[in-house]
C-alpha cells in the first residue's frame, strides 16, 4: 500500500536568463528511494539520480541543469521556452512510483519574483 | 583501450551454483561505471541481471533476487557473479557490460560473453 | 517490470533502402532508451543512447527518435554490414530491459 505523500514547489516563477531550484519531497513512508527521475513538458528527461550511480544528467541539458540541492534540481539560464511543468518522479521500493508536479513561469519582466512555496499538489 | 572478458565454468549440473568473473582492463571498476552482468538466453532474449557499482553498491533483478550475488576486487580489477540454484532455465551466454553513467547512460562495453549450459 | 516490444522480429530490405525499427514500451519511460547492434557471433555493440544520440563512432546513417512510449530506430541508406539484430533497452526504471530484437536481413 502507497502511503507517501510528493511535496513539491508548486506553481513557480522565475526571470528570463536566471535560475530555479525544482524541488520535491517525499514523505509519510519508510520506503526506499531507488531512483529519481526528472522530466519536462514535452517528455524529454532532464536527469535522473540513482541511488547507486548517483547523478546523470540529460545531454540536451548538460550545460545549463545541475544537480540538486539533495535530490532536486537547478536550472540555469532560463529561457522563455523553460515555462511549463516538470515532474519528479520517485521510483520506491517497496512502494512503488510517485509523481510530483511543478509548473514554472518563466517571465520577461525584471521585476519578476522567484515565488516558490512547499504544497501538496 | 577499455577491455571485459569473462571467465568461468562451460557447463554446470542442476542445483549447483555458477560463479563467474569479468576482468577488466583499460580503466579502474572503482571510477564511474556500473558493471553489470547480462545473460542472453537462445533464441537471444537479453536479460539485466544486475550491477555494482564504482563505489561498490548493488543492485539486482527482483527476478534473481534470492538467487545472485554479484561482488568485486578492486586489487585485481575484477568483478563476479554468482548465481545459486541453478536450472535448465539459467542455460544462456553471460556478458559481463559497464555502464557508462556520467554521458552516456547505457551500455558501452561489453566483454565477449561465455556459454553456460545447465545440464546433468 | 516494464516490457519493450518489438513487433518484427524480422526485417528484410536492400543494400541503400531506408529502414526503420519500432519499439513500443509497456509504460512511459521519457527518453531512456538506447539501442544495440549485435552482429552474428558478437556480443551487443551500444548505437543511440537518450533515444537520439549517436554513440561515439556510429556513422550518421544511424539515427533514433522518440519519447514517452514509442521509439524509433532508422538506417537511412543500409549497408551490407548492417546485417544484425538490433535491440532496444530502456533504463527509465530498474530492472533495465531490452525488446525482444528485430533481425535485419539484407535481400
Known amino acids: 500500500m502507497m502511503t507517501g505523500t510528493i511535496e513539491t514547489t508548486g506553481n513557480i516563477s522565475a526571470k528570463k536568463g536566471g535560475s530555479v531550484i525544482l524541488q520535491c519531497h517525499l514523505s509519510s513512508t519508510m520506503a526506499q528511494v531507488t531512483q529519481v527521475n526528472w522530466e519536462q513538458h514535452d517528455h524529454s528527461l532532464l536527469a535522473i539520480r540513482n541511488a547507486e550511480l548517483g547523478w546523470h544528467i540529460y545531454p540536451a541539458f548538460k550545460d545549463r541543469v545541475a544537480p540538486g540541492p539533495g535530490l532536486g534540481l537547478t536550472l540555469q539560464s532560463l529561457t522563455m521556452n523553460d515555462t511549463g511543468e516538470y515532474f519528479c518522479t520517485y521510483h520506491t521500493y517497496p512502494d512503488g512510483t510517485y509523481r510530483g508536479r511543478i509548473f514554472l513561469e518563466v517571465l520577461e519582466s525584471s521585476v519578476a519574483e522567484h515565488s516558490a512555496r512547499f504544497q501538496i499538489p | 583501450d577499455v577491455q571485459l572478458q569473462e571467465s568461468g565454468p562451460g557447463l554446470v549440473k542442476p542445483s549447483q551454483s555458477l560463479s563467474l568473473t569479468c576482468t577488466v582492463t583499460?580503466?579502474?571498476?572503482?571510477?564511474?561505471?556500473?558493471w553489470n552482468w547480462i545473460r542472453q538466453f537462445p533464441g537471444n532474449k537479453l536479460e539485466w541481471m544486475g550491477y555494482?557499482?564504482?563505489?561498490?553498491?548493488?543492485r539486482s533483478n527482483p527476478s534473481l533476487k534470492s538467487r545472485i550475488s554479484i561482488t568485486r576486487d578492486t586489487s585485481k580489477n575484477q568483478f563476479f557473479l554468482q548465481l545459486n540454484s541453478m536450472t535448465a532455465e539459467d542455460t544462456a551466454t553471460y556478458y559481463c557490460g559497464g555502464w557508462e553513467v556520467r554521458n552516456y547512460y547505457a551500455m558501452d562495453y561489453w566483454g565477449q560473453g561465455t556459454s553456460v549450459t545447465v545440464s546433468s | 517490470d516494464i516490457v519493450m516490444t518489438q513487433s518484427h522480429k524480422f526485417m528484410s530490405t536492400s543494400v541503400g533502402d531506408r529502414v526503420s525499427i519500432t519499439c513500443k514500451a509497456s509504460q512511459h519511460v521519457s527518453t531512456a532508451v538506447a539501442w544495440y547492434q549485435q552482429k552474428p557471433g558478437q556480443s551487443p555493440k551500444l548505437l543511440i543512447y537518450?533515444?537520439?544520440y549517436r554513440y561515439t563512432g556510429v556513422p550518421d546513417r544511424f539515427t533514433g527518435s522518440g519519447s514517452g512510449t514509442d521509439f524509433t530506430f532508422t538506417i537511412s541508406s543500409v549497408q551490407a554490414e548492417d546485417l544484425a539484430v538490433y535491440y532496444c533497452q530502456q533504463h527509465y526504471n530498474t530492472p533495465w530491459t531490452f525488446g525482444g530484437g528485430t533481425k535485419l536481413e539484407i535481400k
Open positions: 537518450s533515444a537520439s
Open positions: 555494482i557499482s564504482y563505489s561498490g553498491s548493488t
Open positions: 583499460g580503466y579502474s571498476i572503482t571510477s564511474d561505471y556500473a
